[in-house]
């Protein structure tokens, strides 16, 4: 019987050009986490195997960094990165747990912020 639950950062937003950490946490189970897959809609971003380390899909290798922990850092965000992300926990003996995060990438407001600061 699967007793675990996945806690995620839920709905998050970040600025275009910035970075964001996607985090999930599996709780309420003693099952062993063997692997975590990170996916965006139908695309594989990365895999973290407890013993074998990280696999980063080549189409994301310049913009995705492993960690922290089992999480994933997305860098140089674009508006096209807006959408659903899934952390898929493969565990033994429970099976698979899936968490969902919705990321909204907002147009950068650097210019707006910049106008508020004046160099004397």
């Amino acid at each position: 019987m699967m007793t675990g639950t996945i806690e995620t950062t839920g709905n998050i937003s970040a600025e275009k050009g910035g970075s964001i950490i996607l985090q999930c946490h599996l709780s309420s189970t003693t099952a062993q986490v063997t692997q975590v897959n990170w996916e965006q809609q139908d695309q594989l971003l990365a895999i973290c195997n407890a013993d074998l380390g990280w696999h980063i899909s080549p189409s994301f290798k310049d913009r995705v960094a492993p960690g922290p922990g089992l999480g994933l850092t997305l860098q140089s965000l674009t508006v096209n990165d807006t959408g659903e992300y899934f952390c898929i926990y493969h565990t033994y003996p429970d099976g698979t747990y899936t968490g969902r995060i919705f990321l909204e990438v907002l147009e950068s407001s650097v210019a707006e912020h910049g106008a508020r600061f004046q160099i004397p």
Epitope: N37, I47, H55, K61
Partner: antibody, heavy 119, light 107 residues
């Protein structure tokens, strides 16, 4: 250049154990996981498991769980695969293979070691 | 375990022919698939990774495509040195598994 050099062919009796070595050179041994893949004569490839030389952490194919043990000797940059309780169907070629960095693909392989199990 | 069903198991083609090999996964593996070439008595060599990326130094006549459960490996113009057995491999989830292989021969 990267090299993975395996130990020579072995002949073993059923029920015995065999330990195959894979001596590496030309890269940072502890930074890349090492895997073992086997192949029966004229047959396909079968992944047995992998080891992280840095941590000693292992992942095994459940088919071999309890019979296979993967270890490393960091001082000599050598990986080992020990298979116990040998049976005739373990008469295969065993390969060590290293992964690409941050990718689960085998970029370099050993030359293979034939283990023959025969009474 | 994920089964990788490769077809055909063998084929014979003429030099210059286009050769296509398919691999079907028993469940969705996204693009976590590689293709290896193995010549008799030798270790396998990586040709294609992540379904469609050509490995360093691999000739452009080799290509791969697909995602999910259906994958294709193509040799656009078969050369005599391409005589080998080709294997697909999934690493989406352990245990990592290989297809049964396709032996390519010259007519």
């Amino acid at each position: 250049q990267v090299q993975l050099v395996q130990s020579g062919a072995e002949v073993k009796k059923p029920g015995a154990s065999v330990k195959v070595s894979c001596k590496t050179s030309g890269y940072a041994f502890t930074e890349y996981t090492m895997h073992w893949v086997r192949q029966a004569p004229g047959k396909g490839l079968e992944w047995m498991g992998g080891i992280n030389p840095n941590t000693g952490g292992t992942t095994y194919n459940q088919k071999f769980q309890g019979r296979v043990t993967l270890t490393v000797d960091k001082s000599s940059s050598t990986a080992y695969m020990e298979l116990s309780s040998l049976r005739s169907e373990d008469t295969v070629v065993y390969y060590c293979a290293k992964l690409l960095r941050l990718m689960y693909y085998f970029d370099y392989w050993g030359q293979g070691t034939l283990v023959t199990v025969s009474s | 375990d994920i089964q990788m069903t490769q077809s055909p198991s063998s084929l014979s083609a003429s030099v210059g022919d286009r050769v296509t090999i398919t691999c079907q996964a028993s469940q969705d593996v996204r693009t976590a698939v590689a293709w290896y070439q193995q010549k008799p008595g030798k270790a396998p060599k990586l040709l294609i990774y992540s379904a469609s990326y050509r490995y360093t130094g691999v000739p452009s006549r080799f290509s791969g495509s697909g995602s999910g459960t259906d994958f294709t490996f193509t040799i656009s113009s078969l050369q005599p040195e391409d005589i080998a057995t080709y294997y697909c491999h999934q690493h989406y989830i352990t245990p990592w598994t290989f297809g049964g292989g396709t032996k390519v021969e010259i007519k």
